[in-house]
């Protein structure tokens, strides 16, 4: 049978009287053992049956050195089998064996849970020689025991290549409950049930759990660990913790906040980063996410114009990055812009609206009636056109861009000329003779360059052969005439 020893001092139990389903062990009185060292442990044990030989793993010497008589089998004496003590206390336990003096160099090693204990352990071996035998007492002491010291300790001794093993000494370190699983913070949907888990272990067991919600106990009676609390739903933030109780006292878990998911707060600080004629780049600062990740955002755009029908354009975009380029806008127009973002619960309110404007656009039509003819006497090409009918949004005409391409015997060269807005004619120098010159013209505003007119081609002959007939585009500007000389 296992001999059990307990500490004499025990804190007042949490639950007076016997606990259901458990036995309360009486404290056994401790037996004293004289110590040769100055070390005074918290617990002292003597062998309970000092003379009884251990019959498990023994070394049986065949004969003495004289070869005359058999020696008795060697075995460790029985000692206390189970030591129960509180965390942070000191403990000392020992193995003892009597070894005939014929054996030299006997060493005792300590093992815990099958592994040899080496290094900085407080193991002391003392020898008490007599005429025929030497009594060996191997002591093992642990100061300020921790839970990790729990386990089965044995002594081993090697003699004549044989191993003698002691009975195990079980060390049980008891303390306050230790959490192996604590409730975790969560974000939950309003009025929706969810679970929290709490698990704590001893020793000593059992460990009982109380759940606490906003400082009030949820369960009036203890629940065995592990415990799962099904919270029936919340309408507002709550703080939960669990208390773990055992005979040593109480440990309280961390308090965790359970938040209620809600629609996000509206974005703030919507700002304009860049405006063009047909697009506006905006950014915003997201509002509070309502304890639920943003899914996407919606950019709402209203044209600020008494004549507009007040319709709202909606552009959906991802929640990140907090930036969006609004496209397909009218040039030189005023807009009111707001942003709203959504999470799994729903859409936020719209951010404060901000005003933004697009810039002037480029012209949308090309100059009309482009005419090109050769002025051989001056060695240049005359170009004439009609001013295009531009919309207000295109802004003020600032000039024209003329593209002329010279092609001759597989060589092609494009040149660009800029002329002022008051002109409707231009002259360009002949670059190459015996070549085709292709002319296109585009109107220019601050908003950019409009589309080029359809190309007009004119052949530039070798010197001395002249025809003043012009090349031109008809008014719609969609023909591609070529004048052949």
């Amino acid at each position: 049978a296992i001999t059990e020893a307990r500490e004499e001092a025990k804190p007042y139990p949490l639950f007076p009287g016997p606990l259901p389903g458990s036995l309360q062990t009486d404290h056994t009185s401790l037996l004293s053992l004289p110590h040769t060292s100055g070390y005074q442990p918290a617990l002292m044990f003597s062998p309970t049956q000092p003379g009884r030989p251990y019959t498990g793993n023994v070394a049986i010497p065949r004969v003495t050195s004289a070869g005359s008589k058999l020696l008795p089998p060697l075995a460790f004496k029985h000692t206390v089998g189970h030591i129960i003590l509180s965390e942070h206390k000191d403990v000392k336990f020992n193995c003892s064996i009597s070894v005939p003096n014929i054996y030299q160099d006997t060493t005792i090693s300590w093992w815990k849970d099958g592994k040899e204990l080496l290094g900085a352990h407080h193991a002391i071996t003392q020898f008490y020689p007599d005429d025929e035998v030497t009594a060996i007492i191997a002591s093992f002491s642990i100061t300020s025991v921790q839970r990790s010291d729990n386990g089965s300790y044995i002594c081993k001794m090697k003699i004549n290549n044989e191993e003698i093993v002691s009975d195990p000494i079980y060390i049980e370190v008891q303390g306050l409950p230790h959490f192996t699983k604590q409730p975790e913070s969560m974000n939950v949907t309003r009025n929706t049930a969810f679970n929290l888990t709490c698990q704590a272990v001893g020793p000593p067991e059992p460990v009982n759990i109380f759940w606490v919600q906003n400082s009030s106990r949820v369960n009036e009676q203890p629940e065995k660990s592990p415990s799962v609390l099904t919270v029936p739903g919340l309408t507002e933030m709550a703080v939960f913790s669990c208390e773990a109780h055992n005979d040593k006292g109480l440990t309280v878990s961390k308090g965790v906040q359970i938040n209620i998911k809600a629609i996000p707060s509206p974005p703030t600080e919507v700002s304009i980063h860049n405006s063009t004629a047909h697009s506006i780049l905006i950014s915003w600062v997201p509002g509070f996410d309502g304890y639920s990740p943003f899914r996407n955002c919606s950019v709402q755009v209203k044209e600020v114009d008494p004549l507009s029908n007040g319709s709202v354009m909606i552009f959906n975009t991802s929640a990140s990055p907090h930036m969006y380029q609004i496209k397909q806008l009218q040039a030189l127009a005023n807009y009111s812009i707001g942003v709203s973002c959504m999470n799994e619960i729903g859409w936020s309110a719209v951010s404060p609206w901000i005003l933004a404007s697009t810039t002037e656009g480029a012209p949308s039509v090309a100059p009309l009636n482009v005419t090109v003819f050769l002025n051989e006497s001056r060695d240049n090409v005359d170009i004439r056109w009609m001013k295009p009918l531009t919309k207000r949004q295109a802004g003020e005409l600032v000039g024209y861009r003329i593209s002329h391409v010279w092609q001759s015997a597989g060589i092609s060269k494009e040149l660009l000329e800029e002329v002022g807005q008051n002109n409707s004619r231009a002259q360009i120098s002949v670059q190459v003779h015996n070549a085709t010159c292709t002319v296109r013209i585009a109107a220019v505003t601050k908003g950019g360059v409009g589309p080029f007119s359809d190309p007009v081609k004119i052949f530039i002959p070798a010197h001395g052969w002249v025809d003043h007939a012009p090349s031109s585009t008809p008014a719609p500007g969609n023909a591609d005439p070529v004048l052949i000389i």
Epitope: L19, S216, E220, Q221, A238
Partner: antibody, heavy 118, light 106 residues
Framework: QVQLVQSGSELKKPGASVKVSCKAS????????VHWVRQAPGQGLEWMGW????????TYAQGFTGRFVFSLDTSVSTAYLQISSLKAEDTAVYYC???????????WGQGTLVTVSS | EIVLTQSPATLSLSPGERATLSCRAS?????MHWYQQKPGQAPRPLIY???NLASGIPARFSGSGSGTSYTLTISSLEPEDFAVYYC?????????FGGGTKVEIK
Amino acid sequence: QVQLVQSGSELKKPGASVKVSCKASGYTFTNYGVHWVRQAPGQGLEWMGWINTYTGEPTYAQGFTGRFVFSLDTSVSTAYLQISSLKAEDTAVYYCARGNRYAYMDYWGQGTLVTVSS
Amino acid sequence: EIVLTQSPATLSLSPGERATLSCRASSHVSYMHWYQQKPGQAPRPLIYATSNLASGIPARFSGSGSGTSYTLTISSLEPEDFAVYYCQQWSSNPRTFGGGTKVEIK
């Protein structure tokens, strides 16, 4: 199935004592507290307190201390309400109820009518 | 102690009508439980923790509320629903009941 069965009606004289029993079945008795609720004739429900069946510790509501005692016999899964020095105003139906999480009284006894009359 | 005030004290309605019963707390309450009691019978659990139906309770019963204001709604009264209804708070000791609302046939 879970059941709470209470003792029968009692007719007592003022100054006497009465002991009402509440026998539980269909669940582990020591896992749930037992609450006591009073209902005077034509009146509403009045919470008297509860007893922790795990520790035996009673908790009494204001107005139910002194003459009122909650007790247990866990070996027979029974809770008791004892009222001493009975008064006419103690005439009421007394209910026991099983206390679940969040002090929710999920199963009730059928009630015991205690009549105090000279 | 948290005082629970139920209103109205009596509600006179016809079968098929909607009943709305109120329970106001003198201070903040985390959860409200509701019980139904018929003459000569023990109270019967109806709603657990504000909005959860007790087992065997039909879906025409529903509970809502938070803070100090809680409501029990019966969407369409059946003849067997005419009874007295009590609220009970979970937040702090002592556990208290409201004074009750009697739902009677008009």
